[in-house]
């Protein structure tokens, strides 16, 4: 969380941002809130990005004002217009690109004054893993697959019964480049698994951490998946 009080009396209103991550090819949110104003027409929201000459987005007098918008963001940005009046200046970024990563500034002007706060935005690819029993294998084998990751993640297997066990000797992980030549499909195989045990396939890069659990018994298979973004810090 970054709260922009600023120095040298630069700010007179509080602006708060939250560091976040965007999944390339999907839509992302850059979070920013501020002390609300009673009149929408008095609120100006500007989003800036480091290394970019034009603005990312501008909202003033109750509508988008995109004459200063930089080319790289054309047609890809929107604020939540109906929530601006309550102090939400968050930006929706469509079709997140790898190059959207960097430091952004949320700059607010209201009748109470001006304020700004920066946020770090990471971009990459992350997806939920699915763990299945590989019936084609000669021994009891689990196969963990996740369709889109970038940068290349690490994959670690764990077991509820053999806590602390090192499965690197009995597992094999491969990364296959997807058709767009950026993201990769992650496939990890774990051999010699035992029945009535819960196994976890953990995939992690500097943006996200995802876990796929599987429990195989004589009568059923139970699965559970979880994904967590790693860099959600407020400012």
């Amino acid at each position: 969380l970054i709260i922009g009080f600023g120095i040298s009396g630069r700010h007179s209103i509080t602006v708060t941002t939250v560091a976040s991550a965007g999944n390339i090819g999907e839509d992302g949110i850059l979070s920013c809130t501020f002390e609300p104003d009673i009149k929408l027409s008095d609120i100006v929201i500007q989003w800036l990005k480091e290394g970019v000459l034009g603005l990312v987005h501008e909202f003033k007098e109750g509508k988008d004002e995109l004459s200063e918008q930089d080319e790289m963001f054309r047609g890809r940005t929107a604020v939540f217009a109906d929530q601006v009046i309550v102090g939400n200046a968050s930006l929706r970024l469509k079709n997140v690109q790898l190059t959207d990563a960097g430091t952004y500034k949320c700059y607010i002007i209201t009748s109470k004054g001006k304020g700004n706060a920066n946020l770090e935005y990471k971009t990459g690819a992350f997806s939920m893993p699915e763990v299945n029993v590989d019936y084609n294998a000669s021994s009891e084998t689990l196969r963990c697959e996740a369709p889109r990751w970038f940068p290349q993640p690490t994959v670690v297997w764990a077991s509820q019964v053999d806590q602390g066990a090192n499965f690197s000797e009995v597992s094999n992980t491969s990364f296959e480049l997807n058709s767009e030549n950026v993201t990769m499909k992650v496939v990890s195989v774990l051999y010699n698994v035992t029945i009535n045990n819960t196994y976890s396939c953990m995939i992690e890069n500097d943006i996200a951490k995802a876990t796929g659990d599987i429990k195989v018994t004589e009568s059923e298979i139970k699965r559970r998946s979880h994904l967590q973004l790693l860099n959600s810090k407020a400012s």
């Epitope: 922009g4 009080f5 600023g6 120095i7 040298s8 009396g9 630069r10 700010h11 007179s12 100006v44 500007q46 800036l48 480091e50 290394g51 000459l53 603005l55 501008e58 200063e68 430091t103 500034k105 700059y107 002007i109 001006k114 920066n118």
Partner: antibody, heavy 123, light 112 residues
Framework: QAYLQQSGAELVRPGASVKMSCKAS????????MHWVKQTPRQGLEWIGA????????SYNQKFKGKATLTVDESSSTAYMQLSSLTSEDSAVYLC????????????????WGTGTTVTVSS | DVVMTQTPLSLPVSLGDQASISCRSS???????????LHWYLQKPGQSPKLLIY???NRFSGVPDRFSGSGSGTDFTLKISRVEAEDLGVYFC?????????FGGGTKLEIK
Amino acid sequence: QAYLQQSGAELVRPGASVKMSCKASGHTFTTYNMHWVKQTPRQGLEWIGAIYPANGDTSYNQKFKGKATLTVDESSSTAYMQLSSLTSEDSAVYLCARCGFYDDYYDWYFDVWGTGTTVTVSS
Amino acid sequence: DVVMTQTPLSLPVSLGDQASISCRSSQSLVYSNGNTHLHWYLQKPGQSPKLLIYKVSNRFSGVPDRFSGSGSGTDFTLKISRVEAEDLGVYFCCQSTHVPYTFGGGTKLEIK
């Protein structure tokens, strides 16, 4: 496109003062901090100081304190620098420059520079 | 004040050659939050400076990828992989970690 238009060349007498302007167009004036830089063949580029149009705060290089005074007129999107008690040492090209990005600790870089104002101090 | 020392003063190159400019600071440019605010500018004859690289190694928008920056602490380098005619001019490094901000003396890139 963001642009900074500076006032024309000045020929001034020693001991006099001069006030030059830097008019911003193509961007919202108050969003960006405005810096002033002195350029001479002998000393190269020297940072004079900065003004934050959002509230009129200023920051000066100790060397130019008492020599330069920075102001802004928000209504006309114009930054001004006044130089006082001029000597031949003040003969230079003076550049205004927009700080394109900053945080609470320091300004980052200058992404738009003005056209420059040449000041010649001579009797 | 932080002193920025640029070498060489003059750099004669042939078009298509690689060029390398060094910039050294009298003290570390790493701020307590980990950022290093060292930037590179090019000033062509009769023009104002233009931003090329910010924060050591980040190319500013619209700057060709033949320009690259590297370094850390007190030692920084600007490289131009294949010099073109439009690259000629004076290159300056500048630090904005410490107030007052200071510039290097400049390196003039010229044709051999």
